[in-house]
């Protein structure tokens, strides 16, 4: 229930967050599950624990395994598991599928590629970006905060993009790389007031308590490439990031698709371990562009799992 997969490359920094939640003030102890050996907190160690974070500085293939984190609240100790796999660096340029983060899509005027997991690290701009192992050069490429913007995207821009940055820990620098695929949808067209295809207005979505649930906000904005089009989720009228519930997260970046020639965006809201309290919230799918904003509201209802008796 409280388990998470993480991966990295040998000789790079890897930072993993405990899948079990808790207040920042809570002590978190980490153990290597196979041996039940405590992970030290002293930063002089190559692998050490720092609150909710487990740091491999740098990582080694032998570090692979399951790590247990115990969040010590004032009442109970709460346990989570991090399944860590460290891979050897490839000698050739190909990045294997098991090292790839989720694919993102873009178009001529919507070409952000986010650098995965970067928020866990202590890094300073700018990021370095590579496409198919070649450093990106030229004015079309702009590294902005934690993402890459490509101006005047062309179909040839599709490929595997790697972000590389330096994690700094007590004056020591460690390299981190993360790779994801970028696909291009390029069309000329027109722009319309946003049309939300899903969810339907005032839709009731049935969810099972204790299970994970996904809500997709999908909207179309016209034909071809779109300028300043976005979809996002709000909870009780508040941005997901400001709502402060780590179990409820938007999928990083926006996936672009083309439906019957229309340019559409979708944003997935992931709710982990659905709780009864989630049914009380108002979920708003927002679609906006230069023409204006449209909002569809969803509420969750409890789906009682069917009991199967022999």
């Amino acid at each position: 229930k409280f388990s998470k997969q993480s991966w990295g490359l040998e000789n790079e920094a890897l930072i993993v967050r405990c899948p079990r939640q808790g207040k920042p003030s809570y002590t978190v102890d980490w153990y290597y599950s196979q041996t039940n050996k405590s992970i030290p907190t002293q930063e002089r160690n190559r692998v050490f624990a720092s609150g909710q974070l487990l740091k491999f500085l740098p990582a080694a293939v032998a570090d692979s395994g399951i790590y247990t984190c115990i969040v010590r609240s004032p009442t109970f100790n709460r346990t989570g598991y991090a399944n860590v796999t460290i891979y050897k660096k490839q000698s050739d340029c190909n990045v294997p599928d098991y090292l790839m983060y989720s694919t993102v899509s873009g178009s001529e005027k919507n070409s952000k590629i986010y650098c995965p997991t970067i928020d866990l690290y202590n890094w300073t701009a700018p990021l370095e970006w590579f496409k198919n192992c070649q450093a990106l050069q030229g004015s079309r490429y702009r590294a902005h905060k934690s993402f890459l913007v490509i101006d005047n995207v062309m179909t040839e821009d599709a490929g595997d993009y790697t972000c590389k940055f330096i994690h700094n820990e007590n004056g020591a620098n460690y390299s981190v790389t993360a790779t994801r695929s970028f696909t291009v949808k390029d069309e000329q067209g027109f722009s319309l007031f946003p049309v939300i295809g899903a969810p339907a207005q005032n839709e009731i979505k049935e969810v099972e308590i204790g299970k994970n649930a996904n809500l997709t906000c999908s909207a179309c904005f016209g034909k071809g490439t779109q300028f300043l089009a976005a979809v996002l989720w709000q909870l009780n009228g508040t941005k997901i990031t400001d709502f402060g519930e780590p179990r409820i997260q938007q999928e990083e970046g926006q996936n672009q698709s083309f439906s019957n020639g229309l340019a559409c965006l979708d944003m997935v809201l992931r709710i982990a371990d659905v709780k009864e309290e989630d049914l009380l919230l108002q979920y708003d799918c927002l679609a906006l562009n230069l023409h204006g904003l449209r909002r569809h509201t969803v509420r969750l209802s409890r789906k009682n799992p069917i009991d199967h008796h022999s």
Epitope: R20, T75, I209, G210
Partner: antibody, heavy 121, light 106 residues
Amino acid sequence: QVQLVQSGAEVKKPGASVKVSCKASGYRFTDSEMHWVRQAPGQGLEWMGTIDPETGGTVYNQKFKGRVTMTADRSTSTVYMELSSLRSEDTAVYYCTRAFYNDFDDGFAYWGQGTMVTVSS
Amino acid sequence: EIVMTQSPATLSLSPGERATLSCSASTSVSYMHWYQQKPGQAPRRLIYDTSKLASGIPARFSGSGSGTDYTLTISSLEPEDAAVYYCQQWSSNPLTFGGGTKVEIK
């Protein structure tokens, strides 16, 4: 919706024991620790302890240690609080209560209706 | 244990006035929760994690503070706000409540 329904009022003699029940519904019972808080007439709130229904683990306020026992029955989604060696100062309303999101200990969001326990000779 | 001291014990104000309730902890705590209790009812969570408004609570209630000193503010009192208000810490075992502040509406 989340509901905590407690057993009815009790009148006990000094030295006796009382067992108060709290039946939970509207959420997965093992997902949230259950706490017990009491309130003497005209007085403030006092935390007695908590139980993790998943493991049966308990944490008690030292003040009640040795006298209080909290248990959970997963088959009926019910927690129990038993207080022994009752004295007149144990006369109070006893509440079961739980946090909104368990891991974040974000205050007691849900409360039972309370059970009045009167200790009198 | 951490002792929570609330002041004043009683606050008597007119509708529309601003109410400021204080809670002082004997040792620094990370967060404070606030509850409202009316006669014959169970307490109701108002503010959690120092400043977050609980679901269904009017925006006239707000919380602030850090360390040992915390405040619950009711910006403009309504007649239905007459109640006893409790602060509570969840930083240390045993969890403890303040003695309460009674708010009376003139």
